[in-house]
């Protein structure tokens, strides 16, 4: 399992599908203006492993790529924080690490990554189909959430792990993936935009094979660049798609598809697509105490309607806390 | 209801000891560090130590180093504070306070008040 | 450890003023700060957490601002239940550390 920036592929257009065509022309740019601007936006990656020698001993390990110093890390299974999740661990760059049963070790590996071990024995051991969530608060950036689970057919005694990348530290292939996509990028709108200036701009029409594809597509600069300029991406880097998206991204909208920025809503087309799709991470600047008080029956700020994406106008905060808003 | 209830005052002559309980109710004590927190007359507030009450980890004021000892009864959820080798400069009001790690003190103890007089 | 220093250390206002209180710390401390009403004889009561947030039950006249090392609570209309000594807590590092107190008396 490897932790990688996630591109979206260009495709070529497809070919016959002349208004579409001059459509994407008009689109490319929008989505390569919206990939340069989202080049920063800090990412969280998650990645679960069971453990050969113990079949119910799972090691949680996630990282943040982003430039911001972290303030707190907090782990937690069942889904995201928010949604019912049950905190495993928090760690605490100055103040050290709390874990609860069943975490056996919690522990920073590096500034920005920790790992998890759980115990695999007892009522409140994880089973397979687990969602394990990360959340990492970046001050004064905000927070950003990621979560993952194992593949429900994996058997570590009976099929090999998976075979690891080439030992390639995550934020710098973050940082290098990110910059040869830029770099392409930039080199392939300007060579849209010399190819737009010698030859007259295709009329947009609707296309024969499908009624509502300009409608889907007029959609994506506007809808598309917003969502990706705002919502932090997560890469889950699990070869399985999580037990329950709608518990995993309660934020997602009608459905999960539909929350994805257009250039990352490719369905995949299986466990190994599922492995590389990013999904939004719920960037908030709200506090992490928010959830932390349900359980006394206290208020956690306000945070306006819905959920926050940008900097709260009354200074930053940490996160959502573990234990679910109300 | 939340809520953290502390043993009542004591007087205690120098060099004794004293220990302090906070029994807690209506949260999940081992989620939370509870913290101790003391008060003089006519002082400010002074944080003398933590507990974990899962892990059953602690530390202390380093003021306060070998004299004071934080320790935890999970089954009847109270946390206790003792002080030892008492003087005249630790007569204050004592606190247990509640926290969710990492976000400081929320709900506390009514406190205690210890005297400390030969 | 880290220091955390009031200012003022005591002031007197009238009800329906407009109340701000400051407090320092020695080094950066995020907003990882509490806000505290002491009234002798009772126990210390968190008005605000994380700097600006504030505690539920408590009345929206008092609020919290500041990050890093500079903060303040501001009360935006004193009552006569208001008059009471507020502290900062940093809980960004052990120790935790308490500032030294302002206390609001009435004019």
């Known amino acids: 399992m490897r932790t990688e920036a996630q591109v979206p592929a260009l495709q070529p257009p497809e070919p016959g599908l002349e208004g579409a065509m001059g459509h994407r022309t008009l689109v490319l740019p929008w989505v390569l203006l919206t990939l340069c601007v989202t080049a920063g936006t800090p990412e969280v990656w998650v990645q679960v492993r069971m453990e050969a020698t113990e079949l119910s001993s799972f090691t949680i390990r996630c990282g943040f790529l982003g430039s911001g110093s972290i303030s707190l890390v907090t782990v937690s299974w069942g889904g995201p924080n928010g949604a019912g999740g049950t905190t495993l661990a928090v760690l605490h760059p100055e103040r050290g690490i709390r874990q609860w049963a069943p975490a056996r070790q919690a522990r920073w590996e590096t500034q920005s990554s920790i790992s998890l071990i759980l115990e695999g024995s007892g009522a409140s051991s994880p089973c397979a189909n687990t969602t394990f969530c990360c959340k990492f608060a970046s001050f004064p950036e905000g927070s950003w959430e990621a979560c993952g689970s194992l593949p429900p057919s994996s058997d570590p005694g009976l099929s090999a792990p998976p075979t690891p990348a080439p030992i390639l530290r995550a934020d710098l292939a973050g940082i290098l993936g990110v910059s040869g996509v830029l770099l392409f990028g930039c080199v392939y709108l300007l060579h849209l935009l010399r190819r737009h200036k010698h030859r007259p701009a295709p009329r947009l029409q609707p296309s024969r094979t499908s009624p509502q594809a300009p409608r889907a597509r007029a959609w994506a600069p506007s809808q598309a660049s917003q969502a990706a300029l705002h919502v932090p991406y997560a890469t889950i880097n699990t070869s399985c798609r999580p037990a329950t998206l709608d518990t995993a991204h309660p934020h997602g909208g009608p459905s999960w598809w539909a929350s994805l920025p257009t250039h990352a809503a490719h369905r995949p087309q299986g466990p190994a697509a599922w492995a590389s799709t990013p999904i939004p991470a719920r960037g908030s600047f709200v506090s992490v105490e928010n959830g932390l008080y349900a359980q006394a029956g206290e208020r956690p700020p306000h945070t306006g309607p819905g959920l926050t994406l940008f900097p709260d106008p009354r200074g930053p905060r940490a996160m959502e806390g573990p234990l679910g808003v109300r | 209801q939340v809520q953290l209830v502390q043993s009542g005052g004591e007087v205690k002559k120098p060099g004794a000891s004293v220990k302090v309980s906070c029994k807690a109710s209506?949260?999940?004590?081992?989620?939370?560090?509870i913290n101790w927190v003391r008060q003089a007359t006519g002082q400010g507030l002074e944080w003398m130590g933590w507990?974990?009450?899962?892990?059953?980890?602690?530390d202390y004021a380093q003021k306060l180093q070998g004299r004071v000892i934080i320790t935890r009864n999970t089954s009847i959820t109270t946390a206790y504070m003792e002080l030892s080798s008492l003087r005249s400069e630790d007569t204050a009001v004592y606190y247990c306070?509640?926290?969710?790690?990492?976000?400081?003190?929320?709900?506390w103890g009514q406190g205690t008040t210890v005297t400390v007089s030969s | 450890d880290i220091q955390m220093t009031h200012s003022p250390s005591s002031l007197s206002a009238s009800i329906g003023d407009r109340v701000t209180i400051t407090c320092r710390a020695s080094?950066?401390?995020?907003?990882?700060l509490g806000w505290y009403q002491k009234k002798p004889g009772k126990a210390p009561k968190r008005l605000i957490y994380?700097?600006?947030s504030l505690q539920s039950g408590v009345p929206s006249r008092f609020s919290g601002s500041g990050s890093g090392t500079e903060f303040t609570l501001t009360i935006s209309s004193l009552q006569p239940e208001d008059f009471a000594t507020y502290y900062c807590?940093?809980?960004?590092?052990?120790?935790?550390?308490f500032g030294g107190g302002t206390k609001v008396e009435i004019k």
């Open positions: 209506g949260f999940t004590f081992t989620s939370y560090d």
């Open positions: 994380s700097a600006s």
């Open positions: 507990m974990n009450h899962y892990s059953g980890d602690s």
């Open positions: 807590l940093q809980h960004n590092t052990y120790p935790l550390t």
């Open positions: 080094q950066g401390i995020r907003n990882e």
């Open positions: 306070g509640r926290e969710r790690f990492p976000f400081g003190m929320d709900v």
